[in-house]
């Protein structure tokens, strides 16, 4: 045809895919009746007629357009729905009259691609690696045309480098025309590449302009061979016995090798291995002293069988020894002197303290206490505590007792107790002293005695309420080698009209079932006993 | 076409050390990872060691004291040994061709019963 | 390790039928995830890999779907060919692979 050659560039359309193309034939009226055009498509240089427009009045021909072809703007626009790659071709219009003159249009088709599936190499990277190997892949599904990729490494982009980073990027057509994109990152990495961050980014077009998509970002797991092993202890500080202490073994290298924990023998100077759990960690629950001493890691790389060895480490577990306490069993006549002495040793300096044991009162700060002009009140326990002010929790202690000579003392000398006939009332009598004394009661019932400390003694009796009981009452006496004593309890009878005993009569530590009232230091325990068997 | 195809002894005495084979066709080994997988009867799928195209070896920590992966190029061969086999190493074992992560072809298995 | 659970073990279904197999992930692998069809004699075939991309030369009867932790497999019209047992494997952290659904006709 001649003049082909001057033909000018083709009109250009863009548009996404799924979208409609409005093809808008540019022929001016000089050059032909827009009433009687017919539109061609061009694929691969052959022409195929796809509209004719008759007076004004469009027909699809058969075909692939048949379905998505009309006309719009009175005729001078055609329109394309649903447009998908296969339809990136030129389109032309030719008028027919008053000569043949044709107008040709370039549409481009354009789809953002899906998000890019960013995946990392799920074995890992070795560093010591003889070639690059796949770190990474990109893929990015369902874009036209295809788009491009560029891979970035702590916000950097990748370039090649021969022999270190390799791109290798294809791509597959999907049966809708579409592009998917599949990028490999291939790499030789290093030790710092471990916290390094990768993604990619997809650039493509649209009819709007350029744009782009990030993956999310991804680390890859990198192993290299261990340099350095070192022990680690927990809780960091000083430790104490009772502590739960853990050593573990840590290496710089990944993945970690295969660890065992030594400990020096005092004696041998030998080094021993110890049994650690699963974790490879030593626990020591609880630590004791004898755990102290020289500890050392040994970490053996199973791939290359090459060992590396920890610094040694000085493990203190700080101890408080057994208290002793001299004299360990002290008695003294009343009015005399008694030094008492606290030892004890320990790995860090120790203070002494002297407590009262019934009060906790603080008596002395030191290892020594010295008591004069003793009183019958002064027996009884003295606790030293030895402990170190560095280490809280760390002490131990040890309770002596004093025993003042002197015969019985009563809790109480006499008391009232209300009472029911025929219940069983439980009484108690309480006596100090040294010798620490016995006690015996006046009248026939079931008696249990306590001793409550060396000095101490507590009984009980159990008796039925009888009316010649009620008469006599009940006495219990204390008795040692230096005398004896006594207490009396007065029993009187519950009356429904009294309301309440006489408040000072319920003073002391004797207890009843009698009274339907609480009092202090006292227990109440009733029970009915059966009725006699009547004889004929 | 992309062809794996396992070879090895079906019979193995407890004890002894496995040697297993995988000849490959339709690509090359620098090319593509390959991994060997293991079935026991009546049970899943358990990966057990791979190489990777670049000739990195990996290996499931349960089994890496007593295996070993090689592979040899120009033969499109990967080699795998496993020593010190017990009972429970009876199974189906195949190998299988990395894209670049996921397997794409396998071979068909090679049934391996060990004998106490 | 990454665990992988599928469910159920055991799937009863009539030529025709659609049908979905589960399987979940015990953290997020993301879409690092295939599909598998086991035969006995057979080669292990892929069906779907990247949780949703279909092998090619598999029909597309068989789609898959999921991302993160939850996973399915679905045949839109079950064929006397898909009897067989299915695998889904995890490609994210190492490599694990589900117990396995054995697929049955009714």
């Known amino acids: 045809v001649p003049g082909e050659a001057e033909q000018p560039a083709p009109e250009l359309v863009e548009v996404e895919v799924g979208s409609t193309a409005l093809l808008k034939c540019g022929l001016s009226q000089s050059q032909g009746n827009l009433s009687h055009v017919d539109w061609f498509s061009v694929h691969k240089e052959k022409r195929t007629l796809i509209f004719r427009v008759r007076q004004g009045q469009g027909q699809s021909e058969p075909g692939e357009y048949e379905q998505r072809l009309s006309l719009q703007d009175r005729g001078a626009t055609l329109a394309l729905t649903q447009v998908t790659p296969q339809d990136e071709r030129i389109f032309l219009c030719q008028g027919k009259r008053p000569r043949s003159q044709e107008y040709r249009i370039q549409l481009r088709v354009y789809k953002a691609p899906e998000e890019p599936n960013i995946q990392v190499n799920p074995l890992g990277i070795p560093v010591n690696s003889k070639e690059p190997e796949e770190v990474a892949t990109c893929v990015g599904r369902n874009g036209y045309p295809i788009p491009q990729v560029i891979w970035y490494k702590n916000g950097r982009p990748l370039k090649e480098e021969k022999n270190r980073v390799h791109i290798q990027s294809s791509q597959t057509v999907e049966s809708s025309g579409l592009y998917t994109l599949q990028s490999i990152l291939k790499a030789q990495l290093v030790k710092e590449d471990k916290d390094a961050q990768f993604y990619c980014e997809l650039n493509y077009r649209l009819p709007s302009g350029n744009h782009m998509k990030e993956s999310r970002e991804v680390t890859v797991p990198v192993f290299y061979p261990t340099e350095k092993v070192w022990l680690e202890v927990e809780p960091v500080g000083m430790l104490k016995e009772g502590d739960r202490v853990e050593i573990r073994c840590l290496a710089d290298g990944n993945p970690p090798p295969h660890f065992s924990i030594s400990k020096q023998n005092p004696s041998t100077r030998e080094a021993e291995e110890e049994t650690t759990n699963d974790n490879g960690v030593l626990v020591l629950e609880p630590a004791r002293k004898e755990h102290s001493g020289r500890y050392e890691c040994q970490g053996l790389d199973l791939d290359t069988m090459i060992s590396l060895l920890s610094e040694p480490q000085e493990l203190l577990v700080n101890y408080v020894s057994d208290v002793r306490v001299s004299p360990a069993a002290p008695e003294r006549q009343e009015g005399s002197s008694l030094t008492l002495t606290c030892e004890a040793e320990s790995s860090q300096d120790l203070e002494f303290q002297w407590l009262r044991e019934e009060t906790g009162q603080v008596l002395e700060r030191g290892p020594v206490l010295q008591l004069h002009d003793l009183k019958r009140e002064a027996g009884g326990g003295y606790r030293c505590v030895a402990s170190v002010p560095s280490i809280p929790g760390l002490n131990r202690t040890q309770l002596v007792n004093v025993a003042i000579f002197g015969p019985p003392w009563m809790a109480f000398k006499e008391r009232k107790v209300w009472v029911k006939e025929n219940m069983v009332l439980n009484l108690s009598c309480e006596a100090s002293g040294h010798p620490r004394p016995t006690i015996s009661w006046n009248v026939n019932g079931t008696a249990s005695e306590q001793d409550q400390d060396p000095q101490r003694v507590l009984s009980t009796l159990n008796v039925l309420v009888t009316p010649e009981l009620l008469e006599t009452g009940v006495e219990c006496t204390a008795s040692n080698d230096l005398g004896k004593n006594t207490s009396i309890l007065f029993l009187e009878l519950v009356n429904l009209t009294t309301l309440t005993p006489d408040s000072n009569t319920t003073t002391g530590l004797s207890t009843s079932t009698a009274s339907p009232h609480t009092r202090a230091n006292s227990t109440s325990t009733e029970r009915k006993l059966p009725e006699p068997e009547s004889r004929g | 076409q992309v062809q794996l195809k396992e070879s090895g002894p079906g019979l193995v005495q407890s004890s002894q050390t496995l040697s297993l084979t995988c000849t490959v066709s339709?690509?090359?080994?620098?090319?593509?990872?390959v991994s060997w997988v293991r079935q026991p009867p009546g049970k899943g799928l358990e990966w057990i060691a791979a190489i990777s195209s670049g000739g990195s070896t990996y290996y499931n920590s349960a089994f890496k004291s007593r295996l070993s992966i090689s592979r040899n190029t120009s033969k499109s061969q990967v080699l795998l040994k496993m020593n010190s086999l017990q009972t429970e190493d009876t199974g189906m074992y195949f190998c299988?061709?990395?894209?670049?992560?996921?397997?794409?072809?396998w071979g068909q298995g090679v049934m391996v019963t060990v004998s106490s | 390790d990454i665990q992988v659970t599928q469910s159920p073990s055991l799937l009863s279904a009539s030529v025709g039928d659609r049908v979905t197999l589960n399987c979940k992930g015990s953290?997020?692998?993301?879409?690092?995830l295939a599909w598998f069809r086991l035969k006995r004699g057979e080669a292990p075939k892929l069906l779907i890999y990247?949780?949703?991309s279909l092998q090619t030369g598999i029909p597309s009867r068989f789609s898959g779907s999921g991302s993160g932790t939850d996973f399915t497999l679905t045949i839109t019209s079950l064929q006397p060919e898909d009897v067989a047992t299915y695998f889904c494997?995890?490609?994210?952290?190492?490599?694990?692979f589900g117990a396995g659904t054995k697929l049955e006709l009714k």
């Open positions: 990247d949780a949703n």
């Open positions: 339709g690509f090359s080994l620098t090319s593509n990872g």
């Open positions: 953290q997020n692998i993301y879409k690092s």
């Open positions: 299988a061709r990395h894209r670049p992560f996921y397997f794409d072809y």
């Open positions: 494997q995890q490609y994210y952290s190492g490599y694990t």
